[in-house]
């Protein structure tokens, strides 16, 4: 159960069930800090529920890998779309310059 409070860790308990990648909206990992000396992982599900995950669990480690892979793939897709837009803009610019030259 995540409870964010001053000067203490956020996670009192961790989720008992298995969380599937499809139900994940966000996954945040918090590094150890002066207020909490351990790694904490807080998942936000698509239904809005937030829950703590056990960083020592093999299932959770696997979920993190899958999540990070999914995130990097989405970034690549976004970057790909940006490059495509830039190419289209370049084409349009070159067409305009050609039109000017021909007139």
């Amino acid at each position: 159960t995540p409870v964010v409070r001053k000067g203490r860790c956020s996670c009192i308990s961790t989720n008992q069930g298995t969380i599937h990648l499809q139900s994940l909206k966000d996954l945040k990992q918090f590094a150890p800090s002066p207020s909490c000396e351990k790694i904490e992982i807080i998942a936000t599900l698509k239904n809005g529920v937030q829950t703590c995950l056990n960083p020592d669990s093999a299932d959770v480690k696997e979920l993190i890998k899958k999540w990070e892979k999914q995130v990097s793939q989405k970034k690549k897709q976004k970057n790909g779309k940006k490059h495509q837009k830039k190419k289209v803009l370049k084409v349009r610019k070159s067409q305009r310059s050609r039109q000017k030259k021909t007139t």
Partner: antibody
Framework: QVQLVESGGGVVQPGRSLRLSCAAS????????MHWVRQAPGKGLEWVAL????????YYADSVKGRFTISRDNSKNTLYLQMNSLRAEDTAVFYC??????????????WGQGTTVTVSS | EIVLTQSPGTLSLSPGERATLSCRAS???????LAWYQQKPGQAPRLLIY???SRATGIPDRFSGSGSGTDFTLTISRLEPEDFAVYYC??????????FGPGTKVDIK
């Protein structure tokens, strides 16, 4: 089924020590934060202490800080409360309770039946 | 430390009546961190409401919670004989201690 069973209560003289135990079954103990809550005769509930699921973090009520120590053994599915320098005002029924692990909202969703501690000379 | 005040101290009602119990905090509590418990004589408390308004597993829908900030309410729409008990609110919303209110006793008129 999900169950918490406290033990270790009894009659003890002021200034002496006592250790309470709470045996958990029917759920993944190592995933759950655990609390001790007490209730003096004819009085309301008083939160005493909390330990995180992994035993790293402990929190105490001011009334017991420095005298009581909460601990757990996840390999034995057991929660403990070591009580030192006991006072007459520590006389109460002591309950262990599970912190609800399922989501963002908190609550103690499973309670033991309680064990009675009487501090008297 | 957040102090919780519950009112009234005792509520005398008949079965079938509506019960409205109040819990007031000395400073603002996130609604995510307020719970209600029921306790009958000789028994351990039982979680009724968490997150100010969500019913715990197996709790009948005649129990409902509401409120935010410093004012919270537990309502029992129609009292059943088994509902006569003491009710406690509890806050989780600040650093420990996770205080309980003093309780409201609902007894038979």
């Amino acid at each position: 089924q999900v169950q918490l069973v406290e033990s270790g209560g009894g009659v003890v003289q002021p200034g002496r020590s006592l250790r309470l135990s709470c045996a958990a079954s029917g759920f993944t103990f190592s995933n759950c934060g655990m609390h001790w809550v007490r209730q003096a005769p004819g009085k309301g509930l008083e939160w005493v202490a909390l330990i995180g699921y992994d035993g790293i973090n402990e929190y105490y009520a001011d009334s017991v800080k420095g005298r009581f120590t909460i601990s757990r053994d996840n390999s034995k599915n057991t929660l403990y409360l070591q009580m030192n320098s006991l006072r007459a005002e520590d006389t109460a029924v002591f309950y262990c309770a599970r912190d609800w692990p399922e989501g963002y909202y908190n609550g103690m969703d499973v309670w033991g039946q309680g064990t009675t501690v009487t501090v008297s000379s | 430390e957040i102090v919780l005040t519950q009112s009234p101290g005792t509520l005398s009602l008949s079965p079938g009546e509506r019960a409205t119990l109040s819990c007031r905090a000395s400073q603002s509590v996130s609604s995510s961190y307020l719970a209600w418990y029921q306790q009958k004589p000789g028994q351990a408390p039982r979680l009724l409401i968490y997150g100010a308004s969500s019913r715990a597993t197996g709790i009948p829908d005649r129990f409902s919670g509401s409120g935010s900030g410093t004012d919270f309410t537990l309502t029992i729409s129609r009292l059943e004989p088994e509902d006569f008990a003491v009710y406690y609110c509890q806050q989780y919303g600040s650093s420990p201690p996770f205080t309980f209110g003093p309780g409201t006793k609902v007894d038979i008129k």
